[in-house]
Amino acid sequence: QLPPGKPEIFKCRSPNKETFTCWWRPGTDGGLPTNYSLTYHREGETLMHECPDYITGGPNSCHFGKQYTSMWRTYIMMVNATNQMGSSFSDELYVDVTYIVQPDPPLELAVEVKQPEDRKPYLWIKWSPPTLIDLKTGWFTLLYEIRLKPEKAAEWEIHFAGQQTEFKILSLHPGQKYLVQVRCKPDHGYWSAWSPATFIQIPSDFTMNDEQKLISEEDLGGEQKLISEEDLHHHHHH
């Protein structure tokens, strides 16, 4: 019979700067029923508040809905674990919603093999930003990353797409079935999970000159260039 061990708030995330959730790890088990409560105050205030919603985020969590979420304000929070033997407190955690955004994965991932007559064939990848993110307000800049690999390969090939919501990939193995995924991240914040994988079969006649690859104007902001395999790798890889 001991008091509970010290809990630890280990993660806070917001999908869109409008709501956020924090999660804690319980400390050692005192062998008794233990109640957890999260209390917080905003920087510059002394009034303490209790977590408004212990349900939405699942076990050992606190969810802050829209009415409890303020931008540009630091939240100072701690978790109290209590049983009949006593209480233990986590360290205080300072949270600014601006820096904890982790968006949902991008949506509507579409992948197509394009084989124009006048140019080299390429893989065309297109997606939409996650619904919860409102890009029109200018609050958000989302950056995207694509990964792909042949179905049976172990290593992923990763391409950084910047703010684009479409991307072309030229260097692929003909006849292979590829998995393609995309993820996004705000300028300050965390990468989303990868989107569900989309599969694409690369035709056997998908061939090109290995010495040089032609990247389209859209990829390089209007200037068409002939670049080497090594340059291509640097251009796309992040």
């Epitope: 088990d29 009949q84 033997m85 006593g86």
Partner: antibody
Framework: QVQLVQSGAEVKKPGASVKVSCKAS????????ITWVRQAPGQGLEWMGW????????DYAQKFQDRVTMTTDTSTTTGYMEMRSLTSDDTAVYYC??????????WGQGTLVTVSS | DIQMTQSPSSLSASVGDRVTITCRAS??????LAWFQQKPGKAPKSLIY???SLQSGVPSKFSGGGSGTDFALTISSLQPEDFATYYC?????????FGQGTRLEIK
């Protein structure tokens, strides 16, 4: 009201075993546990270990680890402490105690165990 | 293991006196400290928990203080029924340990 009632005094020979019971009443037994503390004649208090009625967890003092078993029976709201391989050094009053609202707020009356050849 | 050292080991005082018993832990115990009173042939009785909180039904002449590793029990005005042995106990971590006791006798 909360009560912990212990079994009666025991006289045992060296090498024997003893099992002391502690019947709890007046509170929700399943949200706590039973702790055992002993006191040799003229000596101080010594924590032996405890058994949780909440999740079955047990913790023993290292010196008793190999020869003590503590259990709780939620159906009868009773805690048990069994000690094996008794020696004369185990002659003591054995107390059970519990946590109802605050640490060790209720105690049994004690059970004298005498080990003598 | 956390060692608990009580002082003095015995103390003579008169009715009406104010007495203080101290207890030192060998490491920080996060204020998880209790005080018990024991009379001959009786079970211990809990007086104080969490270093300074009074157990239900315990008279306010008993008070606990201290933090970290150094703690004290004060009895503000001794009455005949207060002459007994007092133990401190840490319950911060296993094994739970007690001080060796302070015997409070009538002068």
């Amino acid at each position: 009201q909360v009560q912990l009632v212990q079994s009666g005094a025991e006289v045992k020979k060296p090498g024997a075993s003893v099992k002391v019971s502690c019947k709890a009443s007046g509170y929700t037994f399943g949200t706590s546990g039973i702790t055992w503390v002993r006191q040799a004649p003229g000596q101080g208090l010594e924590w032996m270990g405890w058994s949780s009625a909440y999740n079955g967890k047990t913790d023993y003092a290292q010196k008793f680890q190999d020869r003590v078993t503590m259990t709780t029976d939620t159906s009868t709201t009773t805690g048990y402490m069994e000690m094996r391989s008794l020696t004369s050094d185990d002659t003591a009053v054995y107390y059970c105690t519990t946590v109802v609202r605050r640490p060790f707020d209720f105690w049994g009356q004690g059970t004298l165990v005498t080990v003598s050849s | 293991d956390i060692q608990m050292t009580q002082s003095p080991s015995s103390l003579s005082a008169s009715v009406g006196d104010r007495v203080t018993i101290t207890c030192r832990a060998s490491q920080d115990i996060n204020n998880f400290l209790a005080w018990f009173q024991q009379k001959p042939g009786k079970a211990p009785k809990s007086l104080i928990y969490a270093a300074s909180s009074l157990q239900s039904g315990v008279p306010s002449k008993f008070s606990g203080g201290g933090s970290g590793t150094d703690f004290a029990l004060t009895i503000s005005s001794l009455q005949p029924e207060d002459f007994a042995t007092y133990y401190c106990q840490q319950y911060s971590s296993y094994p739970i340990t007690f001080g060796q006791g302070t015997r409070l006798e009538i002068k």
